[in-house]
Interface confidence: low
């Protein structure tokens, strides 16, 4: 999908590649002379649709699901974005310039132009992984962003990952060949669901309150420096380091991949002709040309690879999973032919793995990656990809072993460091995770500049009491990952009003608030009755958000679905809520009772999305000792009164009373979301 910077991809002639086909030829000359228009990209298939956003029909009933406490860490304490397999395709001109030097690796450009209608995308996929989420799972996605001219409210990722894990030669098609992989480390299962930062434009952008200086923060009380809290050492001048430095790496010229074996060199003209068709976007003709070459020369690896690429292209054009499965099969066929050049073998299997992930076939992708590592045991980037493969199926132990092996050989590999740090943090080895996450981000290596790593590093630092956490949040904000230092949700719609605390009038949901406050005793009594009769319906928080204490919840609605079993325990409350679709229809939120016992502290944490606001109705509130901080303002609950806050801002809870605290949590759509957005935004 990317708008390719050909100068970087193709070396010196790249600047003359005016028609965007990857070479300098007559067409380019025409463009440069003003005789022909520059080419533009066709919309490509938004790959995040590879996993259906809507919940699968056969999903476990809500009452059987692990409950998502405050539901924040659920998607968020975890999900990380990384550029998976960079540049799987090959320049068409590789055939013409087989032994020439290659240019600098392409910088991925992550503004993608595309239509985002859900219905037009690939038909329903069959992911091999569960759609449920608990705490630390890994997700895969391909990054796309919204075509702003379309009134589409699909969630789009704008995570910025310009680089990639292995700079091999790029195909110039406007593909996002490097599926961004979002990881949510789950304890037990992997989830394949895109992480997104919705590219939805709302005309009026209201700056968050932290745009204005706050003279006194309740949270940050030490030296007010925008720079690190600890003393610094000067960074020594650059020495002759090897290629751990990404800038140095870029300077090391990679050899042009050799894609033709001896036989293929004899049919080079025919291969070139077919490849030219593919490059020109004449996909159906190219498919036929390569099919004919495969028929004529069944032992030709390059012809087979060309056929696979064409099928890959066709799958996108037709938005067909069936065609894509064929491409995946053909990439495999390439690898099984005799006398396949090593470079071609690697490209073919990497692309196969990538496309398998696109379809949600994580285990199949893992097998492909394992084979790649066996074939190319000295390629660190493949080992890094293998680590991701394990994370995607929830096998953190094997992933950890892979990254330990990488770091034992290349101790300065930033990609391995951030992932290793991530795994340590998922295992609750908070302090141990910090240096790996920090050094990994600081390395600047491809795949390390990602919001989730900043999120985890900051979170780990907060948990060990290191105020430098805010430096990393600030840096994450400045690098485009967070809306602000305080607002660090990752599933966002751009331009929504951002403030930590809201009044009922500001939300527009005054009727709902009135109804909750008028009926608070009814709501309270039903909650207390469930506590007395069916304690098992209150499930403990299981997302590692507590420093200490006891905190449970009883969920009535989740992801816009009513939990019928739970509503039997609180029938009047459920009936009351049915009148308010802004909450019952809020597929990015929940409605639930929340009980917190004395001696509980909930770590500072951030919700997953800016698309909802959270109402807290006080039901049983001890006289003192219970408080909630959102951003830099701390408040207390009152029985029968509603507090409203935006949980995409950092918040923290203390329960130091002498008896339990019971509140009723009601999530509502952010009031600035349009009806269409509310209908089309995928559930969280």
């Amino acid at each position: 999908f990317d708008l390719v910077d050909y100068e970087e991809v193709l070396g010196k002639l790249g600047i003359y590649d005016a028609d965007g086909d990857g070479d300098f030829d007559v067409d380019d000359a025409k463009v440069l002379l003003g005789l022909k228009e520059r080419s533009t990209s066709e919309p490509a298939v938004p790959p995040e649709e590879a996993e259906p956003h809507t919940e699968p029909e056969e999903q476990v009933p809500v009452e059987a699901e692990p409950q998502n406490i405050e539901d924040e860490a659920k998607e968020q304490i975890q999900s990380l974005l990384h550029e998976m397999v960079h540049a799987e395709h090959v320049e068409g001109e590789d055939l013409q310039q087989e032994d020439g030097p290659t240019g600098e690796p392409q910088q991925e450009d992550d503004e993608f132009l595309m239509a985002t209608d859900v219905d037009d995308r690939f038909e329903t996929l069959e992911p091999e992984v569960s759609h449920e989420e608990t705490e630390h799972s890994y997700h895969v996605e391909e990054t796309v962003s919204q075509d702003c001219n379309q009134d589409m409210e699909e969630m789009m990722s704008e995570q910025e990952n310009p680089d990639s894990s292995e700079p091999v030669v790029e195909d110039e098609r406007l593909h996002h060949d490097t599926d961004d992989v979002t990881y949510q480390v789950y304890e037990e299962q992997a989830v394949y669901e895109p992480l997104e930062n919705e590219g939805i434009e709302i005309t009026e952008v209201t700056a968050p309150p932290e745009d204005n200086p706050v003279e006194d923060s309740q949270v940050i009380v030490e030296e007010v420096s925008i720079f690190p809290v600890e003393e610094q050492q000067e960074v020594p001048p650059e020495t002759n380091r090897k290629t751990d430095d990404p800038e140095q790496k870029a300077k090391v010229k990679k050899k042009k991949p050799k894609l033709l074996n001896k036989f293929d060199k004899t049919i080079k003209a025919e291969l070139d002709a077919a490849e030219k068709l593919r490059k020109r976007g004449k996909i159906e003709e190219a498919v036929n040309a390569f099919k004919e070459l495969v028929r004529k020369y069944p032992q030709s690896p390059r012809a087979r690879y060309g056929k696979a690429q064409c099928e890959d292209d066709l799958a996108e054009k037709r938005r067909s999973n069936e065609v894509l499965r064929g491409a995946i099969e053909t990439y495999q066929e390439v690898a099984s032919l005799p006398d396949v050049p090593a470079d071609l073998l690697k490209l073919s299997l990497k692309r196969r793995s990538d496309r398998q992930q696109f379809l949600g076939h994580m285990r199949g992708s893992l097998l492909t990656l394992q084979r790649l590592v066996q074939l190319f045991p000295n390629d660190t980037s493949l080992k890094n990809d293998l680590g991701v493969g394990y994370l995607l199926i929830g096998d953190n132990d094997n992933a950890k072993k892979v990254y330990e092996e990488v770091l034992s050989v290349t101790p300065n590999d930033g990609f391995a460091k951030v992932h290793y740090g991530f795994i340590l943090k998922a295992q609750n080895k908070i302090a141990e995770s910090i240096p790996y996450l920090k050094e990994g981000i600081e390395s600047g290596d491809p795949g390390t500049d990602d919001g989730r790593f900043y999120f985890h590093l900051g979170d780990a630092m907060q948990r060990v009491g290191n105020k430098e956490a805010y430096k990393w949040y600030e840096l994450g904000h400045k690098r485009g990952h967070f809306a602000s230092v305080w607002q660090r949700s990752l599933y966002n719609v751009n331009g929504l009003k951002a403030q930590p605390w809201w009044t009922p009038k500001e939300t527009g949901y005054t009727e709902l608030v009135k109804s909750l406050e008028r009926n608070w005793k009814l709501i309270r009594d039903e909650g207390l009755a469930v506590m007395d009769k069916a304690k098992g319906l209150f499930l403990p928080e299981d997302e590692n958000l507590r420093e200490k204490g006891d905190w449970s919840q009883f969920t009535l609605w989740q992801q816009g679905r009513r939990n019928e079993n739970a509503c039997k325990g609180a029938p009047k409350t459920c009936t009351l809520l049915e009148k308010f679709p802004e909450t019952t229809g809020c597929r990015r939120g929940q409605i639930k009772y929340s009980i917190m016992h004395p001696g509980t502290h909930v770590w500072p944490h951030t919700g997953p999305t800016n698309c909802r606001l959270r109402m807290h109705l006080g039901l049983v509130i001890p006289k003192e000792g219970c408080k909630i901080r959102c951003a830099n303002e701390t408040r207390t609950w009152e029985e029968g009164k509603v507090l409203i806050f935006d949980d995409s801002f950092e918040h923290e809870v203390w329960q130091d009373a002498s008896s339990f605290r019971l509140i009723f949590i009601v999530d509502v759509w952010h009031p600035e979301l349009t009806p269409q957005q509310r209908r089309s935004l995928p559930a969280i």
Epitope: D5, E8, Q107, E108, D109, D110, E158, E160, P162, D163, E201, V205, A207, P208, E210, D211, N212, P213, V214, E215, S217, V219, I220, E223, V224, S225, I226, F227, P228, E231, Q232, V235, E442, G444, K467, Y470, K471, Y473, E474, L475, H477, K478, R479, G480, H481, S484, V485, W486, N494, G495, N632
Partner: antibody, heavy 125, light 115 residues
């Protein structure tokens, strides 16, 4: 009203030294990082130093490291820039500025939101 | 390496709308930048901070005629109903912290002439 007033510029010979200062008023000086920025005769702006609010941390581009020293006296609300081993390419107008705020408040902490009038430095024999 | 690219000059008729571009290098395309205005014989003045999503916060005393927007690696400063006092050099800047070291880079500036 935020005010930044530079002083101490002048004509210096190559290899010489110079220390100039910036007096701040109208805001809580000790809460802000403070940078120096210079503007070459060709009107190009170049950041040359930043010091953190408490003075513990100093930052320089490689082009001036070792020759320029930024410091501050929060009691006097004053920022300083010491220049040594001056070269002709150091000829410029030097501005002090205020750079953002601290964690958790303004997210404008990289922005140089107020600037002084500048003090001119000419390095010539 | 952090790099900002600006065209060197632009001319606009009085009362027209102007749109200036500052382009980040691809690797840093998500970064938040700042715009500054420098009128003849005056120090630079902070105009706004501009994020990748186009949201922006303007500095003190900046008229409503100034707005910002973003597209990809491009950051735009728009001036509607341009006035003689808007004749100035407009400079973009961006900061980052790399391996514990702070850096701040300015673009070359665009000289705006009001005809």
């Amino acid at each position: 009203e935020v005010q930044l007033v530079e002083s101490g510029g002048g004509l210096v010979k190559p290899g010489g030294s110079l220390k100039f200062s910036c007096a701040a008023s109208g805001f809580t000086f000790s809460r802000y990082a403070m940078p120096w920025v210079r503007q070459t005769p060709e009107k190009r702006l170049e950041w040359v130093a930043t010091i953190s609010s408490g003075g513990s941390y100093t930052y320089y581009p490689d082009s001036v490291k070792g020759r320029l020293t930024i410091s501050r006296d929060n009691a006097k609300n004053t920022l300083y820039l010491q220049m040594s081993s001056l070269r002709s390419e150091d000829t410029a107008m030097y501005y002090c500025a205020r750079q953002g705020n601290y964690y958790g408040s303004s997210h404008l902490y990289y922005a140089m939101d107020y600037w002084g009038q500048g003090t001119s430095v000419t390095v010539s024999s | 390496q952090l790099v900002l690219t600006q065209s060197s000059s632009a001319s606009f008729s009085l009362g027209a709308s102007a749109k200036l571009t500052c382009t980040l290098n691809s690797q840093h395309r998500a970064y938040t930048i700042e715009w500054y205005q420098q009128q003849p014989l005056k120090p630079p003045k902070y105009v706004m901070e501009l994020k990748k999503d186009g949201s922006h916060s303007t500095g003190d005393g900046i008229p409503d005629r100034f707005s910002g927007s973003s597209s990809g690696a491009d950051r735009y400063l728009s001036i509607s109903n341009i006035q003689p006092e808007d004749e100035a050099i407009y400079i973009c800047g961006v900061g980052d912290t790399i391996k514990e070291q702070f850096v701040y880079v300015f673009g070359g500036g665009t000289k705006v002439t009001v005809l």
